[in-house]
Amino acid sequence: FPMFKRGRCLCIGPGVKAVKVADIEKASIMYPSNNCDKIEVIITLKENKGQRCLNPKSKQARLIIKKVERKNF
């Protein structure tokens, strides 16, 4: 539940470039806020295998963000 951690960015370092879609249970997008001045894409893996930060500049992250934002407006 990354959304409940407050006061700092959640991702340390650049993050991974890609995660296999078949391994992804869900994803969260954290938009810039007072807590963190950058966008973060957090992947939750299937089978309780934890979470990964996706590099927001990666092709996969940009695709996710683009699809989400296109649907919103």
């Epitope: 879609v21 992804i24 249970e25 869900k26 649907k71």
Partner: nanobody
Framework: EVQLVESGGGLVQPGGSLRLSCAAS????????MGWFRQAPGKQRELVAS???????IYADSVKGRFTISGDNAKNTVYLQMNSLKPEDTAVYYC??????????????WGQGTQVTVSS
């Protein structure tokens, strides 16, 4: 950015009732699941109830028979009717949604939380 807007929290006496609501800020979304979690001071977050598209409705054992979750697809809204409230139901209640954008996995969203306090 989709936002989940919660309302309905407050102070209620033991045995009383409250109805929480949570609405997604945009229409036309494909919502896989919506639900409620709660977190009491010093405790871990726990699932209260969840409703899925075409799937089962899930309740925590501690609220079965007292709480009822329902959804309004047209309004992208989920409700939690809480009856026979107990002091141990006191917590911050968070709305959660899993939205399908055709990526092969859903995007998860959380509300900001609404406080429910059960006390005499």
């Amino acid at each position: 950015e989709v936002q989940l807007v919660e309302s309905g929290g407050g102070l209620v006496q033991p045995g009383g009732s409250l109805r929480l609501s949570c609405a997604a800020s945009r229409s036309g979304l494909s919502i896989n699941a919506m639900g409620w979690f709660r977190q009491a001071p010093g405790k871990q977050r726990e699932l209260v109830a969840s409703i899925t598209r075409g799937g089962p409705t899930i309740y925590a054992d501690s609220v079965k028979g007292r709480f009822t979750i329902s959804g309004d697809n047209a309004k992208n809204t989920v409700y939690l009717q809480m009856n026979s409230l107990k002091p141990e139901d006191t917590a911050v209640y968070y709305c959660n949604a899993l939205i399908d954008y055709g990526l092969g996995f859903p995007i998860e969203y959380w509300g900001q939380g609404t406080q429910v306090t059960v006390s005499s």
